[in-house]
């Protein structure tokens, strides 16, 4: 994690039930102005949906992200439906951008 | 399908003001964040902003108290507004979807903008 | 803002060969990177999300990868398509920036 991080982490304040990184970036981004949201367990807890602020401008109580932390292992298959009742991406001539394969980890930091 | 497909007039004179417009197919935009990009000619890809399936907008601060950008979801419309164009300001004018939880995964051909007198 | 620097700005291969491009980001991104082709017509079409996620369609000779603060795009065998500029670009904070662009020539 080299000097000079400018992502703050908070957990997300508006996001609730299983986590899916799609609805989690949406979430944050829509709902709490922030940069990113992504999918992550801390500790031993469940997978929780965080969101990722620039630090210099970065909400009250928002923390360093931890190294590696973003962005989320993508998520394998086709997209979920957005999570504010938008209508649903198109098929997958159209937009959806699943892996072809399962879910690597997240980017490693050195 | 999903498209986006760029309109703009081409030729601006300085001191003008220019509207780009940025039609999309295939996805609405209640769902997704539209950015946009220019290439002045024989360089690189710079950044201008982007209005989110929200309406709420970021835009790039060099450019910021110039443009504006705005949307009707009705008609699948997001628009690119400039004013004060310099000769810099000549550039291919992209349209790029947000796709949440990846990147920029679909973009317009562009529109080329000459700013000249 | 963060100043991505592209290398090289320009490169020659040939059919087959392996090429390896490279972005590194002046401060941390947290591997919210992505790597773009544009064609000589001007068409600029995704590759890869998150440092190393292929979108879906993209060729597994694409592949991409991250060490600390440097990013690399590798494409493992050439092919005619592939000729063409390609751009990374961070997303971790605004203002998003591209990296300066790799011209990429048949030899």
């Known amino acids: 994690h080299m000097a000079g991080s400018k992502l703050c982490e908070k957990t997300s304040k508006t996001y609730s039930g299983k986590c899916d990184n799609k609805k989690c970036d949406k979430k944050c981004i829509e709902w709490e102005k922030a940069q990113h949201g992504a999918c992550h367990k801390r500790e031993a807890g469940k997978e929780s949906c965080f969101c990722y602020f620039d630090c210099s401008k970065s909400p009250p109580g928002a923390t360093p992200a931890p190294p590696g932390a973003a962005p989320p292992p993508a998520a394998g298959g086709s997209p979920s439906p957005p999570a504010d009742g938008g209508s649903p991406p198109p098929p997958a001539d159209g937009g959806s951008p699943p892996v072809d394969g399962g879910s690597p980890p997240p980017p490693s930091t050195h | 399908q999903v498209q986006l497909k760029e309109s703009g007039p081409g030729l601006v004179a300085p001191s003008q003001s220019l509207s780009i417009t940025c039609t999309v197919s295939g996805f609405s935009l209640i769902s997704y964040g539209v950015h946009w990009v220019r290439q002045p000619p024989g360089k690189g890809l710079e950044w201008l902003g982007v209005i989110w399936a929200g309406g709420r907008t970021n835009y790039n601060s060099a450019l910021m108290s110039r443009l504006s950008i705005s949307k009707d979801n009705s008609k699948s419309q997001v628009f690119l507004k400039m004013n004060s164009l310099q000769t810099d300001d000549t550039a291919i004018y992209y349209c790029?979807?947000?796709?949440?939880?990846?990147?920029?995964?679909?973009w317009g051909q562009g529109t080329t903008l000459t700013v000249s007198s | 803002d963060i100043q991505m620097t592209q290398s090289p700005s320009s490169l020659s291969a040939s059919l087959g060969e392996r090429v390896s491009l490279t972005c590194r980001a002046s401060?941390?991104?947290?591997?919210?990177l992505s790597w773009l082709q544009q064609k000589p017509d001007g068409t600029i079409t995704r590759l890869i999300y998150?440092?190393?996620t292929l979108y879906s369609g993209v060729p597994k000779r694409f592949s991409g990868s991250r060490s600390g603060s440097d990013y690399s795009l590798t494409i493992s065998s050439l092919e005619s398509e592939d000729f063409a500029d390609y751009y990374c670009l961070q997303y971790a904070i605004y203002p998003w920036t591209f990296g300066g662009g790799t011209k990429l020539e048949i030899k």
């Open positions: 401060q941390e991104i947290s591997g919210y």
């Open positions: 790029a979807r947000y796709y949440y939880g990846s990147s920029l995964d679909y």
């Open positions: 998150a440092a190393s």
